[in-house]
Interface confidence: low
Amino acid sequence: APVIEPSGPELVVEPGETVTLRCVSNGSVEWDGPISPYWTLDPESPGSTLTTRNATFKNTGTYRCTELEDPMAGSTTIHLYVKDPAHSWNLLAQEVTVVEGQEAVLPCLITDPALKDSVSLMREGGRQVLRKTVYFFSPWRGFIIRKAKVLDSNTYVCKTMVNGRESTSTGIWLKVNRVHPEPPQIKLEPSKLVRIRGEAAQIVCSATNAEVGFNVILKRGDTKLEIPLNSDFQDNYYKKVRALSLNAVDFQDAGIYSCVASNDVGTRTATMNFQVVESAYLNLTSEQSLLQEVSVGDSLILTVHADAYPSIQHYNWTYLGPFFEDQRKLEFITQRAIYRYTFKLFLNRVKASEAGQYFLMAQNKAGWNNLTFELTLRYPPEVSVTWMPVNGSDVLFCDVSGYPQPSVTWMECRGHTDRCDEAQALQVWNDTHPEVLSQKPFDKVIIQSQLPIGTLKHNMTYFCKTHNSVGNSSQYFRAVSLGQSKQLPDESLFTP
């Protein structure tokens, strides 16, 4: 490494003295530091000798000598103090710009090392440095702010005590830029508002920004509202708020409100809808049909939306029947949003006894409102065939239950068979009007179909086949011998 003469690391001189700094090295060297215009380079040995014939406080600083041919060989430094009682500080810059998070150096250099224990940093106007600003003093570099924040942006002055008197530097403007500058953050509250005419309302438009230079306005439609601006400083951010307070709202207060905040970087906007109504309201709606049909064992969720103002105070789901035995506790949840509720009733693996009416009732200041769902269960057909002589003639009766009402088809097939389709059948009868024995709401339909045969034929099998949207079922009846008969179930009663 090069050698500096006189040897350092520090050199203290008086104003007006001649100072010569010589850099001794095997090759060419270069000086770095606050050189121009206060120094001259010796023409005899260009680059190696720095000279000033009349040292002033402005020569205070750190000087570095580096070998040109071999920068890796290192460099050597010396710090020069020109101690001038009239000038305690040498400012190397009037303005410093850094990016948030970096170290910010405020280069006010003390001209006399003896003063370094009484230095302090202030903001312009005699204000203290922010409590959250972390900084320290280096006699060679000045005041150093660690991890500068946008909020540290300010004009700073360096102070020290000289002979019991305060000596203050001129200001250094520190500008700390955001890593990614952005428009102010905004909030418009509430996000939706409903009021009855005559009620009070408040809409608050607020914006926060790291720098103080930004604006915020509240508009109704395209009209800018003249509302006082409240400013605050919280959590290292500037906050500006415009709050619209209405003691008794009227219809003309309704509309779309916009909160607009802007700075040099750009603008952000938030909107909300303010609705003024004549009176309280409670509207219940469902996107589902109020007439629900599901198969036994299926699950379903009944969903109702309520739009209400003011808040719903009471609500309840109730089962209205008709089956009250074996009732389980209704399981439901309610989701709340602003002026909107979603009521969900869970019906899991519904049983026969759970068909019927489900009633949601809700109440707010508008009064009570309700919605009723009718739940009908679908059942696969169940079939039973019997024989009976009627007026000396043989008649087969097919009793069928199920929902929706099953269709009935009779087939006569040769032989003792347990399988027969229309292609194999000797005769096929579709009973389009079976007798309805029972048709209660929410219950299975029970029907009866009659097949008058006259005389049962030996070695014939009669099938009653039934079908609905849930499944099919059939049963056969076989004449075994004259005077005797056998009624037998189909092997598969139910094929979904």
């Epitope: 009855i196 009620e199 009070a200 105070q313 949840i333």
Partner: antibody
Framework: QVQLQQSGAELVKPGSSVKISCKAS????????MHWIKQQPGNGLEWIGW????????EYNQKFNGKATLTADKSSSTAYMQLSSLTSEDSAVYFC???????????WGQGASVTVSS | EIVLTQSPTTMAASPGEKVTITCRAS?????MSWYQQKSGASPKPWIY???KLASGVPDRFSGSGSGTSYSFTISSMETEDAATYYC?????????FGSGTKLEIK
């Protein structure tokens, strides 16, 4: 934020009346139900009733019919509860609490202590 | 009126221990709320609509139940959880509260 500021402690004589106030801020006073709750020393909570300040509508726990009267002043966003014909049984801390809808008392006042003693 | 019976009346738990408080209603209720009250302070909503945590309540708290039986659980007791907890129903007026469970730290 929502705040309910109740009036201070009261020391009153048996047979007299007392009126407790509850000043609301941070929300729309007229559009939310204000409830009143009683808590006797070392005891649980007892619901007295509610008032809807928008129109003055009230609902009381039957136990407090004739004992408590709930009112509200929209202009000052203040709810009041008057307790009459006081006895030592009425010595308690009384809370006001606001309900925004649904099944919860969302914010409570700090409580007002009433001591009935001769 | 619906009477709410809370148990236990008092209990002590060590830090990290699981705590369960039960509340039984004299007739079926839709939802249960729970409030926390510390000495000399107002009750604070802690759990509402049976299982929803109020704003700012740590997720070590939970609530469950239906019909006439409800419970309140702290998965891992912490010192700051020492307080009195009340259950509260709103299925019918008059609104009623449980008698409270005083939870202390061991």
């Amino acid at each position: 934020q929502v705040q309910l500021q109740q009036s201070g402690a009261e020391l009153v004589k048996p047979g007299s009346s007392v009126k407790i106030s509850c000043k609301a801020s941070g929300y729309t006073f007229t559009s939310n139900f204000m409830h009143w709750i009683k808590q006797q020393p070392g005891n649980g909570l007892e619901w007295i009733g509610w008032i809807y300040p928008g129109d003055g509508d009230t609902e009381y726990n039957q136990k407090f019919n004739g004992k408590a009267t709930l009112t509200a002043d929209k202009s000052s966003s203040t709810a009041y509860m008057q307790l009459s014909s006081l006895t030592s049984e009425d010595s308690a801390v009384y809370f006001c609490a606001v309900n925004y809808g649904g099944y919860v008392l969302d914010a409570w006042g700090q409580g007002a202590s009433v001591t009935v003693s001769s | 009126e619906i009477v709410l019976t809370q148990s236990p009346t008092t209990m002590a738990a060590s830090p990290g221990e699981k705590v369960t408080i039960t509340c039984r209603a004299s007739s079926s209720t839709n939802y249960m709320s729970w409030y926390q009250q510390k000495s000399g302070a107002s009750p604070k909503p802690w759990i509402y609509e049976t299982s929803k945590l109020a704003s700012g309540v740590p997720d070590r708290f939970s609530g469950s139940g239906s019909g006439t039986s409800y419970s309140f659980t702290i998965s891992s007791m912490e010192t700051e959880d020492a307080a009195t907890y009340y259950c509260h129903q709103w299925s019918s007026t008059p609104l009623t509260f449980g008698s409270g469970t005083k939870l202390e730290i061991k």
